[in-house]
Interface confidence: medium
């Protein structure tokens, strides 16, 4: 299979190279927030497969922004192959293996395994459909393969890597970590408010994604989505957290300047190769 | 190099049932996701559905939500598209093509003309 | 849902440089992709990302997008580049893709 040896640039007629990603937030697009301040950071670009340089205006954004290019090589890039993957002579597991369980932020609730490194075991856990992590395997089969330690200690070697001539480094081929954004969606948190069909008038609040916050609104009683909590705080605690909004320490006053939408960067249906 | 080739377009009648082919090669057809797009005569380009790349998800437009099934058989490299209850106004050439990063549609077939009409 | 609103016709002497925009709600937070699509012929993608060209896709097409507009570029429009437009994103919402209405580029 020759799909990851494509050129850098995209070219329609012929086979897409795959795209791997460390951490789900590698793919937004950057955003510079609501305030005016001129601070450069960096963020990963998922068409260019590297990480640029944007201006940040000090507020607000999302998770896809860094203080310096090394930090998002870091974090979203595996340009340097022996920080994915060591040689197979020194038989150690890849960083992805030492990444926390990531569910994603859809609802697809589809059985995975990933390797804890508290119990050095790969465990089963519920997946999204969408986001995550890779260190998310569709067998126990393969999660032990890649991660887990041999019966001598060392990590077993049937690991096979392929040369990803998009960014010159070594991607795993046995991990199938499922399309980015897989058309599993919508996060319930990203739907919007649904009164439903009945008549009552409960106080409900929702996660509004245009605007990053959690806000009140009437629930009918029955039907309407998930997009739909108790209290404002379990609201929060449910949907704030996959898409953080920083305010810089530096305390910057948002303008008024006309307040560009916080809608969230990524669309959840978002289509992407299976073998991302 | 990738093809897609679109087949099953004609002349039918209102309310009747026509079923669209996609046939794809020169790529991992099961890797993708793929959707189907028309154009009405002389307009503009209308999303119509899409569909996960291993089937378990479909998305229709709410113009043909109910009447339209979109299915893939990837042991066959195929794309399809069930229409029934076929009305005028879903007059057009379809497209499908593969959907790529960030819902950007890398890959068209040529299209397949649909005419619904008495 | 996201509209995309493209002007229905923008004409352009050989030579000149042809501006084609798409506006949208708060579009510069989503990635904006151009098609050309000529008489009787499959849409060609010309711009992703923004800003990237495909590659066999001249330089003197460019793009870029930011606040509520994207904007095709096209640099010293030649006879060839007349043809049809079309802008297109992505909706939070339930569509995976969603268009601009179209422009007519004329090259007089």
């Known amino acids: 299979d020759s799909e990851e040896d494509e050129e850098h640039t995209i070219i329609t007629d012929t086979e897409l190279p795959p795209l791997k990603l460390m951490h789900s937030f590698c793919a937004f697009k950057a955003d510079d927030g609501p305030c005016k301040a001129i601070m450069k950071r960096f963020f990963f670009n998922i068409f260019t497969r590297q990480c640029e340089e944007f201006i940040y205006g000090g507020c607000e954004g999302n998770q896809n922004r860094f203080e310096s290019l090394e930090e998002c090589k870091k974090m979203c890039t595996r340009d340097n192959a022996n920080r994915i993957i060591k040689t197979t002579l020194q038989q150690e597991k890849p960083d992805f293996c030492f990444l926390e369980e990531d569910p994603g932020i859809c609802r697809g609730y589809i059985t995975r395994y990933f390797y804890n490194n508290q119990t050095k075991q790969c465990e089963r856990f519920k997946y999204g459909g969408c986001l995550g992590n890779m260190n998310n395997f569709e067998t126990l089969e393969e999660c032990k393969n890649i991660c887990e330690d041999g019966p001598n200690g060392f990590q077993v070697d049937n690991y096979g890597t392929q040369l990803n001539a998009v960014n010159n480094s070594l991607t795993p081929q046995s991990t199938k970590v499922p399309s980015l954004f897989e058309f599993h969606g919508p996060s319930w948190c990203l739907t919007p408010a649904d009164r439903g069909l009945c008549r009552a008038n409960e106080n409900r609040f929702y996660y509004n994604s245009v605007i990053g916050k959690c806000r009140p609104f009437k629930y009918s009683g029955c039907g309407g989505n998930e997009n739909n909590f108790t209290s404002k705080q379990e609201c929060l605690r449910a949907c704030k957290k996959g898409f953080i909004q920083r305010i810089s320490k530096g305390g910057l006053i948002k303008t008024k300047r006309k307040r560009k939408k916080q809608r969230v960067k990524i669309a959840y249906e978002e289509i992407f190769v299976k073998n991302m | 190099q990738v093809q897609l080739v679109e087949s099953g377009g004609g002349l039918v009648q209102p309310g009747g049932s026509l079923r669209l082919s996609c046939a794809a090669s020169?790529?991992?057809?099961?890797?993708?996701?793929m959707t189907w797009v028309r154009q009405a005569p002389g307009k503009g380009l209308e999303w119509v559905s899409g569909i996960s790349y291993n089937g378990s998800n479909t998305y229709y437009a709410d113009s043909v939500k109910g009447r339209f099934t979109i299915s893939r058989d990837n042991s066959k490299n195929t794309l399809y598209l069930q229409m029934n209850s076929l009305r005028a106004e879903d007059t057009a050439v379809y497209y499908c093509?593969?959907?790529?990063?960030?819902?950007?549609?890398?890959?068209w077939g040529q299209g397949t003309l649909v005419t619904v009409s008495s | 849902d996201i509209e995309l609103t493209q002007p229905p016709s923008v004409s352009v002497a050989p030579g000149q440089t042809a501006r084609i925009s798409c506006s949208g709600d708060?579009?510069?937070?989503?990635?904006a992709y151009w098609y050309q699509q000529k008489p009787g012929q499959a849409p060609v993608l010309v711009i992703y990302g923004d800003m990237n060209r495909p590659s066999g896709i001249p330089e003197r097409f460019s793009g870029s997008n930011s606040g509520n507009t994207a904007t095709l570029t096209i640099s010293g429009t030649q006879a060839e580049d007349e043809a049809d437009y079309y802008c297109?994103?992505?909706?939070?919402?339930?569509?995976?893709?969603?268009f601009g209405g179209g422009t007519k580029l004329t090259v007089l």
């Open positions: 093509a593969r959907i790529y990063y960030m819902n950007l549609l890398a890959g």
């Open positions: 297109q994103s992505y909706d939070a919402g339930v569509k995976p893709a969603v």
């Open positions: 708060a579009l510069g937070t989503y990635y």
């Open positions: 020169g790529f991992t057809f099961s890797n993708y996701s």
